[in-house]
């Protein structure tokens, strides 16, 4: 008996078409994506074949101007015109709190959502019960697959979950809901979620009982064969992962934002073994029409965003200093204020012990595009914004040794002077360089903002301790020349759209006045 | 659970036809086709034919002049039909799921006078 | 229609020994290859399907390997329970079986 698995992750906001790198759609002849066009695929496989399934794997949520605007309805209406099959919750459908999920999504979805390690208790749990499921048991066919959910038990730090949601470990949690489906004699089990690649492999191995593992979180890349776009495949698709007790058990994911399709097709004997496993993702590129119905919806939707992008956020009462010649050769303002706004972003009070989690942020100023004049009655719009942030990129939790937070520093100044955008912008760090220094040696003082303490003060860097940063998916992924950060990083999590993170800060505060004021010497 | 159980004649005399059933629990037929399979005593085991999922059905080409296989969807049931039985047919008859991952316990059916 | 070709066809060895039964197919069957055994009184299982996944309650003394054309079977530690006749069976087209291994007390 054969399956096809379509499978998402990771869409974040990607409801239009996008450019090749996930950006804002230029050239409509080049664009990828969108969920016109994903239906136009999905469809496509719908008719040519029996059974089956299109899951995601979370991560819907947060990512361009659509999240900001329409806060999770539109995932549900369009996920429902796709007919998604279930959904895996992910770290960032809880980016506008519990009731952000409930409302929007889980109360529109027609479609099951599933976490089988996320346990409600309190007065939540009576509110929320029966709108999430650990597992759900689909008809496919003159067959049933078990679908068990899972989320990064990470949420808590990389979103805003409450205090009334426990996120248990993945596979205590898995197991028995897994023995549960296998008391119900459902022998085809799919683990569906978003913890990671090495999560997803980890569950593939230890969880008896599953089948295949759709995943997300990760963004990873999986392909057999030569690539069809940029993206680099982190291994053969599907992944290939022995179970402790003797099963070869695929993984899969699909990479991110919509840009490609997962397709695989599994094989299954009559105990619901895998017997094969085969596929690839499928690029969604402008060989593939749009859908002319979903097109129209997208377009009728798209009205609001359009009145949205000119209305004032709250206003500077300071000139908002973005300029090429401040941020790439000093502390600017702009970049003080975006630093601010990512640690901002990021309060999570989930231990005593703590005042933050996370206290330091580093950007890179070329990556601030462009000031904003105080002297347009001081309004801030998102228009304003996305001239500053206009990659559509995200600001990502990642933890690095203070070795690697050293060298960045040292990086940053290592050519100063030729206007080059790898001069950093900071917050929760004070640095002070000699620039009359060799190259490498620049950094005479690099101070930090203390997490474990009630009282935030700086301390110096110690280079054997590992510290969390905010920083732009670009220097994540050794943007910049910033390989180091790339190639030591200990942990990263993606984040939330750059724009509106600064865009939340401005209307929280609603008058903003960000000074230089020593941060970088 | 998975089972396969074949039931039929113990004995079958020469030029008869045997008729055996193989009934299905646990998994359907609908999804799922059947092996049929014989090993003569002492002997090694040889492939006799199948049923697909779809009604469709495949034969051992030393076979195909005399045997047919059908089944009843609604009742779990697979039967196999071999016409012209020699002594040489004496076997055990196994029925076992399409991918072998379940078998039938086997019946030893005798053809003698 | 494909071929299989068992060997050894039969093998004496004692409890603790590591036992290796090889099958080479007439062409390349892509992995889908099976081995069961079969206990005296006649009873079919399947302990390995798809060339190295070990069928459920199957201990993890046996295990499977191969590609293209050449399959192996492999019990690491012989225990009494495990002297028996073994079996390869591709399923790539119709169904064949290899010879057989019975695998004796020394």
């Known amino acids: 008996w054969e399956l096809t698995i379509l499978h998402t992750n990771d869409v974040h906001s990607r409801l239009e078409q996008t450019s090749e790198d996930s950006s804002k759609c230029v050239n409509a002849s080049r664009c990828m994506g969108g969920v016109a066009r994903l239906f136009t695929k999905v469809q496509q496989i719908r008719r040519a074949e029996p059974n089956v399934l299109l899951l995601d794997a979370g991560d819907q949520y947060q990512g361009t101007i659509w999240f900001t605007v329409y806060k999770g309805a539109e995932v549900a209406h369009f996920m429902n015109a796709l007919r998604y099959d279930a959904m895996a919750l992910g770290n960032h459908e809880f980016d506008n709190g519990v009731e952000g999920l409930i409302e929007p999504l889980l109360k529109e979805a027609k479609f099951p959502i599933l976490s089988a390690n996320i346990k409600a208790k309190g007065p939540l749990a009576s509110q929320i019960s029966g709108l999430y499921l650990p597992y759900k048991v689909l008809p496919v066919g003159d067959e049933v697959v078990g679908i068990v959910g899972y989320t990064s038990k990470e949420t808590p730090f990389l979103s805003n979950p409450g205090t009334n949601l426990v996120f248990e470990d993945e596979i205590t949690a898995l197991q028995p809901e897994v023995d549960k489906l296998k008391t119900l004699n459902v022998n085809k089990i799919i683990a569906l979620g978003h913890s990671g690649f090495e999560m997803d492999k980890l569950i593939a191995q230890k969880v008896r009982g599953v089948d295949v593992v759709v995943g997300g979180h990760s963004n990873t890349f999986l392909y057999t064969g030569n690539p069809p776009s940029k993206e680099v495949p982190a291994g053969k698709y599907p992944f290939i992962v022995t179970s402790d007790d003797g099963r070869k058990v695929p993984v899969v994911q699909a990479y991110a934002f919509g840009k490609y399709l997962g397709y695989l097709k599994i094989e299954f004997d009559e105990r619901g073994n895998v017997i094969s496993s085969h596929g690839n993702p499928i690029l969604l590129n402008s060989s593939i029409p749009e859908d002319p119905s979903i097109k129209a919806d997208i377009n009728k939707w798209r009205i609001k965003l359009d009145n949205y992008s000119t209305q004032e956020l709250g206003k500077t009462i300071v000139y908002l200093d973005g300029s090429s010649q401040s941020c790439r050769f000093r502390e600017c303002n702009m970049g003080n204020l975006i630093c601010d706004a990512m640690i901002n972003n990021n309060l999570r009070h989930t231990d005593e012990m703590f005042w933050n989690h996370v206290s330091m942020c580093i950007l890179n100023g070329g990556g601030i595009r462009s000031p904003i004049d105080e002297r347009n009655n001081g309004t801030i719009t998102w228009e304003n914004l996305a001239a500053v942030l206009p990659f559509g990129g995200t600001f990502d939790l990642v933890q690095l040794k203070g070795s690697t937070l050293k060298k960045a520093f040292e990086h940053s100044v290592h050519r100063y002077g030729q206007s080059t955008g790898e001069f950093l912008q900071v917050g929760g760090i004070h640095v002070v360089y000699d620039l009359s220094r060799k190259p490498g040696d620049r950094v005479v003082k690099l101070d930090v903002l203390c997490t474990k303490c009630r009282v935030p003060s700086y301390d110096p860097l110690k280079m054997d301790e590992v510290y969390k940063v905010i920083l732009p998916n670009f220097l994540a992924n050794g943007g910049d020349g910033f390989q180091m950060i790339k190639d030591e990083l200990l942990r990263h999590d993606s984040g939330d759209q750059d724009i509106n993170v600064v865009s939340t800060y401005i209307s929280k505060m609603k008058v903003i006045y960000p000074a230089v004021e020593g941060r970088i010497k | 659970e998975v089972t396969l159980k074949e039931s039929g004649p113990v004995l079958v005399k020469p030029t008869e036809t045997l008729t055996l059933t193989c009934t299905v629990s646990g998994f359907s037929l609908k999804s799922y086709g059947i092996q049929w399979v014989r090993q003569p005593p002492g002997k090694l085991l040889e492939w006799l034919g199948v049923?697909?999922?779809?009604?469709?059905?495949d034969y051992n080409a030393a076979f195909i002049s005399r045997l047919t296989i059908s089944k009843d969807t609604s009742k779990s049931q697979v039967v196999l039909t071999m016409t012209n039985m020699d002594p040489v047919d004496t076997a055990t008859y196994y029925c076992?799921?399409?991918?072998?991952?379940?078998w039938g316990q086997g019946t030893l059916v005798t053809v003698s006078s | 229609d494909i071929q299989m070709t068992q060997s050894p066809s039969s093998l004496s060895a004692s409890v603790g020994d590591r036992v290796t039964i090889t099958c080479r197919a007439s062409?390349?069957?892509?992995?889908?290859l099976n081995w069961l055994q079969q206990k005296p009184g006649g009873a079919i299982k399947r302990l390995i399907y798809a060339t190295s996944s070990l069928d459920s309650g199957v201990p993890s003394r046996f295990s499977g390997s191969g590609s293209g054309s050449e399959y192996t079977l492999t019990i690491s530690s012989l225990q009494p329970e495990d002297f028996a006749d073994y079996y390869c069976l591709q399923y790539a087209g119709s169904w064949t079986f290899g010879g057989g291994t019975k695998v004796e007390i020394k």
């Open positions: 076992a799921g399409q991918y072998g991952s379940v």
């Open positions: 062409q390349d069957i892509g992995d889908r």
């Open positions: 049923i697909w999922s779809g009604g469709s059905a």
